[in-house]
């Protein structure tokens, strides 16, 4: 056959649906690879094909569009399926062509089967809500185009395996479910489950979601530097080991970069030549407020490095601060045997 | 560690504010609960305050107390109009903030509260 | 609000025997439970958190199973230091703040 620009196996876009459930799949092609829509396309007299590969098998092979009751169909750039089936998992490729042209890409449909409390090997999105921050809501997700607006489908929500019905707290809307005061114990998955008939048979849709209770930025603060501080001396003899923990709490903040950084006489410490390492770890609470520590080490100190100003940075989208480390050379212990000797020397 | 205090023999309908006072932790970063324990009864929990101030009550509370945090340090229960059977000793704890479910792992050693005309 | 129901109200157990507490909440509250020790003159102290997790520090004799309505708090071989009243709590009804404790068990360690 002749040429066709092949985008390959588009394993960004790792598709999962429920086995017994309906799903329309978009031609990947007009979404990520070209800058023309399938409009556009098909006035060019251009012609989207579908093909595919089972699972465990190499042979590429047509899609079956002649199903009882059009299990599988396409409509302009959409595969749809009504229902799926366990075996219809594999490779999809969608070709678009005519005499001069030809572009085509892959991508993996994994259809998977779900226990009756909606647990499934299926990726959940995460969507994260504001402790106590008033009323909050999460929307049944990628449920557009399967029906028209003129079907009012049934939507039953869930909690983990318990329909939410008669709660105080979370209150389903239709597609929408409404948290007024989301707390800790709101964390966990919640299920939609969408009914609704065409052609005189029943569809359900089902979406689960996990929904994670984090910080509120009501009250965020900037960062707060715990060590080092004004309580704590770094009092070393020359040739010992200098270690400077830097710890600070960031509060959660959607899309915040919280940074930690030390600097040793005003400079990184990459721009100076003593030997210096240092050591991160990061700990999180359950409502993704951050810790991060920072342990400077310089393995031998020296005279002129116990001079030196070791100050501790931090900086997130609430501020920045930072605090010196009290560091000072250790005064030797008088030699006391010494000195007693001298003193019962004089006597 | 957490303390609670103001405590003390008061006649019906005085009001009463009792204090939870907490160190080596910041209340802005934790939730706190109230409960109570009559002389020789079980454990009856009052009210709850979120990290964020927000608050919650038994429903048979109908108002007669009220949970405020004061400070970044303190929590107040106040009792708005005592009678006998609020005779008890009152607890404060802490929610350890570590799991995904709330755990009232810290509490204060309590402060009794004597009702009697 | 949710109720919990404790049962049985006192048990008597020889040492190394097998106590076995039930807690029933009057509406599904998931894995929202905790189990409680107390002493007399003491506060509680946690020893389970989402029905069947183990608190720092506390031995493996106790655990903790059940989820939706029905809970149970086991001892295997039970020590004389075990004899204490037992509290089941909801830790967050129906995901609100609601913190609804059982009526005790009174564990007697023979």
């Known amino acids: 056959s002749e040429r066709c620009d092949d985008w390959g196996l588009d394993t960004m876009r790792q598709i999962q649906v429920f086995e017994d459930e309906p799903a329309r799949i978009k031609c990947p092609l007009f979404e990520h690879f070209l800058k023309f829509n399938y409009s556009t396309a098909h006035s060019a007299g251009l012609t989207l094909i579908w093909y595919w590969t089972r699972q465990d098998r190499d042979l590429e092979e047509p899609i079956n569009f002649r199903l009882p009751e059009n299990r599988i169909s396409k409509e302009k750039d959409v595969l749809w399926f009504r229902p799926t089936l366990l075996n219809d998992t594999g490779n999809y490729t969608c070709m678009l062509r005519n005499t001069t042209y030809c572009s085509k890409v892959a991508f993996p449909l994994e259809v998977v089967q779900k226990d009756s409390c909606f647990n499934s090997p299926m990726k959940l999105p995460v969507h994260k809500l504001y402790i106590e921050y008033g009323i909050q809501r999460i929307t049944c997700p990628n449920v557009d185009g399967y029906f028209p607006s003129s079907v009012k489908p049934t939507i039953t929500w869930y909690m983990g395996c318990y329909k939410i019905q008669n709660f105080n707290n979370v209150i389903p809307e239709g597609m929408n479910l409404s948290f007024l005061i989301a707390l800790i114990s709101n964390n966990g998955n919640y299920t939609c489950v969408v009914t609704y008939p065409e052609n005189g048979r029943t569809f359900h849709l089902t979406r689960t979601l996990t929904v994670k209770v984090v910080g509120s930025p009501k009250n965020a603060v900037p960062p707060v530097i715990h060590s080092p501080n004004d309580h704590v001396v770094y009092e070393k003899e020359p040739g010992e080991e200098l270690l400077i923990p830097c710890t600070v709490y960031f509060s959660f903040l959607m899309d915040s970069r919280n940074e930690v950084w030390w600097t040793i006489d005003g400079k990184k410490p990459d721009d100076i030549t003593i030997d210096v390492t240092i050591n991160e770890s990061i700990s999180h609470s359950r409502t993704e407020d951050e810790t991060r520590t920072q342990i400077l080490s310089i393995k031998k100190v020296t005279s002129e490095d116990l001079k030196r100003s070791y100050v501790c940075h931090a900086r997130s989208a609430k501020g920045e601060v930072a605090k010196a480390a009290k560091v000072k050379q250790k005064v030797p212990a008088p030699r006391y045997t010494v000195e007693l000797a001298c003193g019962f020397g004089a006597t | 560690s957490l303390e609670e205090s103001g405590g003390r023999l008061v006649t019906p309908g005085t009001p009463l504010t009792l204090t939870c006072t907490v160190s080596?932790?910041?209340?802005?970063?934790?939730?706190m609960i109230w409960v109570r324990q009559a002389p020789g009864k079980g454990l009856e929990w009052i009210g709850f305050?979120?990290?964020?101030?927000?608050t919650w009550y038994a429903s048979w509370v109908n108002g007669r107390f009220t949970i405020s945090k004061t400070s970044s340090t303190t929590v107040d229960l106040k009792i708005t109009s005592p009678t006998t059977e609020d005779t008890a000793t009152y607890f404060c704890?802490?929610?350890?903030?570590?799991?995904?479910?709330?755990?009232?792992?810290?509490w204060g050693q309590g402060t009794l509260v004597t009702v009697s005309s | 609000d949710v109720v919990m129901t404790q049962t049985p109200a006192s048990v008597s157990e020889p040492v190394g025997g097998t106590v076995t507490i039930k807690c029933q909440a009057s509406?599904?509250?998931?894995?929202?439970l905790a189990w409680y020790q107390q002493k007399p003159g003491q506060p509680p102290k946690l020893l389970i958190y989402g029905a069947s997790t183990l608190a720092s520090g506390v031995p493996s004799r106790f655990s903790g199973s059940g989820s939706g309505t029905e809970f149970t708090l086991t001892i295997s071989g039970v020590q004389s230091a075990d004899a204490a009243t037992y509290y089941c709590?909801?830790?967050?009804?129906?995901?609100?703040?609601?913190?609804?404790f059982g009526g005790g068990s009174e564990v007697v360690v023979k």
């Open positions: 709590q909801c830790s967050g009804y129906d995901t609100t703040g609601v913190f609804p």
């Open positions: 509406q599904n509250i998931g894995s929202n």
């Open positions: 305050i979120g990290r964020g101030g927000s």
């Open positions: 080596g932790f910041s209340l802005s970063r934790c939730a």
């Open positions: 704890a802490r929610d350890g903030d570590y799991s995904d479910y709330y755990t009232f792992d810290l």
